[in-house]
């Protein structure tokens, strides 16, 4: 009888532990990646930003992978994705090639299985950065809720990368899992 | 035998209740604080906004504390932090000393143990607000995922506080816990 | 004796399943709605955007309802709400009626019980879109944490709807439930 009770309890405990494992708040993947200022591309064209910190300052990652400039999903789920991108220019940095700028960010998803890239979110503004002002600044914030599959990759593209603000509080992106896929 | 079963069940229930307590969705801390735009001091390029509503309109708080103008963390965890700051000026409000403005927000974290302040997120824009237009408006939104420890404090600093939009739907900040720290 | 044990286990399982149901990550409502470009209103006045995709591209919905241009809450809770709205104009689209624009978004909550509408979040900017530039672009992002009751409705209002960017990565809004109401 006592053996039977223990077997029953093990069944209950087994499923309970399974639930605990699945619903435990610590199990949820996340990442917050901050720009690596030593490796920002030059120019005014649209480029993919491949150098980010995931293990210093505010940068952190758990149950996701950062590789080749991309944030890789390891766990299927619905994620909230966000990006904050700051651009700035000071007159001491020299003249701008043009006063009319497109300051843009694109958050893209790439699937390895089907080698294609899709823009999940975009944001930005056209700006007139006149020489009458000694300093110019502009920030973009985007965020949204997306279904991501294991192996899919998130990357950030911007225009005018040479104008990026290299501070960790200025230029970053991230993700956190909110729920499983049904 | 029956007593033994109850003891076994109590063990299961005990751990189950412990899980329930830990994973229960209602246990998660959050705050959404809306601006109280009265009596904002001047004297520095950016000023800390110390007066916020947490118990009226959209303002609310649970398992966090609001004190001395700061949002205090009571529970270790990873939190999503956000801020929305709106600036506006109407010609009837009087003049501006300059058309070139820096409209900025800084979300800062202060640790009491190590009395230092760090900027987690910043955003904003330089703006040219000409007197040729009767009304000007600009909003900033920032958000990010951060590890916060009990006792740490979140505060908001802005430039040009006299230009803040005092509506509760315009100028606010908040946080909600997403997951525990491993 | 064996029957008694099963009854005890059923009690444990019953409450456990109840917890599982309540805390299960998949049970949480969400929506990500992308603009339906075929049905964008014209004009420059403030209008409610009623046509959104919830079942194609990035658009998706679960445990919430989309009806009559509104996102309807089916489950009480605290939700994170967000919106990203992009405006653009190219000189090939013809002249603007005015170069001074207010590009705004308002995220509103309507309660059927008390037929009233309240703005939860607003954002935007006044812009000077001069004819000197062939292309203009501007994006707004807002987000915040709000208590929503079953039956309440979320809608999006914008100024200058004819300038909206119709891409699914540009103009969207969404919500996901974070926690229950105590």
């Amino acid at each position: 009888g006592s053996q039977h009770i223990r077997a029953e309890k093990a069944m209950v405990d087994g499923s309970w532990l399974d639930l605990a494992k699945r619903s435990k708040l610590e199990a949820q993947p996340f990442a917050h990646l901050t720009i690596n200022a030593t490796d920002i591309p030059s120019g005014s064209h649209k480029v993919s930003l491949s150098s980010w910190y995931h293990d210093r300052g505010w940068g952190k990652i758990s149950n996701m992978t950062f590789s080749n400039g991309k944030l890789i999903v390891n766990q299927d789920g619905f994620y909230y994705l966000y990006a904050n991108i700051c651009f700035r220019h000071h007159e001491t940095s020299g003249d701008l090639a043009t006063e009319y700028l497109q300051l843009m960010v694109y958050v893209t998803k790439t699937s390895i299985k089907i080698p294609s890239s899709h823009t999940l979110m975009k944001g930005g503004s056209t700006k007139y950065w006149s020489g009458n002002s000694e300093f110019h600044f502009y920030s973009i914030n985007v965020g949204g809720f997306f279904k991501l599959r294991s192996g899919e990759e998130i990357s950030i593209e911007v225009s005018n990368p040479s104008l990026l603000d290299p501070d960790q509080d200025a230029t970053y992106f991230g993700a956190f899992k909110v729920r499983d896929i049904d | 035998g029956s007593q033994h079963i109850r003891a076994e069940k109590a063990m299961v229930d005990g751990s189950w209740l412990d899980l329930a307590k830990r994973s229960k969705l209602e246990a998660q801390p959050f705050a959404h604080l809306t601006i109280n735009a009265t009596d904002i001091p001047s004297g520095s390029h950016k000023v800390s906004l110390s007066s916020w509503y947490h118990d009226r309109g959209w303002g609310k708080i649970s398992n966090m504390t609001f004190s001395n103008g700061k949002l205090i963390v009571n529970q270790d965890g990873f939190y999503y932090l956000y801020a929305n700051i709106c600036f506006r000026h109407h010609e009837t409000s009087g003049d501006l000393a300059t058309e070139y403005l820096q409209l900025m927000v800084y979300v800062t974290k202060t640790s009491i143990k190590i009395p230092s302040s760090h900027t987690l997120m910043k955003g904003g824009s330089t703006k040219y607000w000409s007197g040729n237009s009767e009304f000007h408006f600009y909003s900033i939104n920032v958000g990010g995922f951060f590890k916060l420890r009990s006792g740490e404090e979140i505060s908001i600093e802005v430039s040009n506080p006299s230009l803040l939009d005092p509506d509760q739907d315009a100028t606010y900040f908040g946080a909600f816990k997403v997951r525990d720290i491993d | 004796g064996s029957q008694h044990i099963r009854a005890e286990k059923a009690m444990v399982d019953g409450s456990w399943l109840d917890l599982a149901k309540r805390s299960k990550l998949e049970a949480q409502p969400f929506a990500h709605l992308t603009i339906n470009a075929t049905d964008i209103p014209s004009g420059s006045h403030k209008v409610s955007l009623s046509s959104w995709y919830h079942d194609r591209g990035w658009g998706k919905i679960s445990n919430m309802t989309f009806s009559n241009g509104k996102l309807i809450v089916n489950q009480d809770g605290f939700y994170y709400l967000y919106a990203n709205i992009c405006f653009r104009h190219h000189e090939t689209s013809g002249d603007l009626a005015t170069e001074y624009l207010q590009l705004m978004v308002y995220v509103t909550k309507t309660s059927i019980k008390i037929p009233s509408s309240h703005t939860l979040m607003k954002g935007g900017s006044t812009k000077y879109w001069s004819g000197n530039s062939e292309f203009h672009f501007y994006s707004i992002n807002v987000g915040g944490f709000f208590k929503l009751r079953s039956g309440e409705e979320i809608s999006i209002e914008v100024s200058n709807p004819s300038l909206l960017d119709p891409d699914q990565d540009a103009t969207y809004f969404g919500a996901f439930k974070v926690r229950d109401i105590d």
């Epitope: - | 009596d39 000023v47 009087g94 000393a97 070139y100 403005l101 040729n132 040009n160 506080p161 006299s162 | -």
Partner: antibody
Framework: EVQLVESGGDLVKSGGSLKLSCAAS????????MSWVRQTPDKRLEWVAS????????SYPDSVKGRFTITRDSAKNTLYLQMSSLKSEDTAMYYC????????????????WGAGTTVTVSS | DTVLTQSPATLSVTPGASVSLSCRAS??????LHWYQQKSHESPRLLII???QSISGIPSRFSGSGSGTDFTLSINSVETEDFGVYFC?????????FGGGTKLEIK
């Protein structure tokens, strides 16, 4: 050296007009708001007019609104005050002052003052 | 308009003494108050900004305090060059206004 030099003050009849000038040097004139402040014979100070750095904002107290006009010429680094329909109560020492602020562009303190120019309105 | 009332109108002191000059606002102006000194036959000179911030080049014996409606300019150990008229000015609300002044004279 940062300097403001006013000129144009004179004795004028009630109802008459006068234009004051202020030459700025030693700083980037186009990046500062400017103002005129007057000191009445009883030594009270009164703000009279302000203009933004780019010249698109101007403001006046009710006492001079509609009669005084502040302008600037950044190419010449010069500030002007055109006064018309002058009254005896406009009699004062007129100072040109640089407007500054730290926190908000709506703020105003005067960190550089000229030596002043005297305006006397006789009835 | 915000009215600034300075007191006393005249203050007679001997060099070496410490003095406090008052400026009271008709409504709260936070810390948007500035102090000026004007010596005889000279133009005003900025001393203190935002109630308590000292200006570069101004002697450290000058200090300011206060917030809301009540403000004080203190001079620690008055020197002969400090005699003149002191004005306060608010920038909290338009139009910008000055106090009537306090004349600091030698006793």
């Amino acid at each position: 050296e940062v300097q403001l030099v006013e000129s144009g003050g004179d004795l004028v009849k009630s109802g008459g007009s006068l234009k004051l000038s202020c030459a700025a040097s030693g700083f980037t004139f186009s990046r500062y708001g400017m103002s005129w402040v007057r000191q009445t014979p009883d030594k009270r100070l009164e703000w009279v007019a302000s203009i933004s750095s780019g010249g698109t904002y101007t403001s006046y107290p009710d006492s001079v609104k509609g009669r005084f006009t502040i302008t600037r010429d950044s190419a010449k680094n010069t500030l002007y005050l055109q006064m018309s329909s002058l009254k005896s109560e406009d009699t004062a020492m007129y100072y040109c002052a640089r407007r500054n602020f730290i926190t908000s562009a709506t703020d105003c303190y005067f960190d550089v003052w000229g030596a002043g120019t005297t305006v006397t309105v006789s009835s | 308009d915000t009215v600034l009332t300075q007191s006393p109108a005249t203050l007679s002191v001997t060099p070496g003494a410490s003095v406090s000059l008052s400026c009271r606002a008709s409504q709260s102006i936070s810390n948007n108050l500035h102090w000026y000194q004007q010596k005889s036959h000279e133009s005003p000179r900025l001393l203190i900004i935002y109630a308590s911030q000292s200006i570069s080049g101004i002697p450290s014996r000058f200090s300011g305090s206060g917030s809301g409606t009540d403000f004080t300019l203190s001079i620690n150990s008055v020197e002969t060059e400090d005699f003149g008229v002191y004005f306060c000015q608010q920038s909290n609300s338009w139009p910008f206004t000055f106090g009537g002044g306090t004349k600091l004279e030698i006793k």
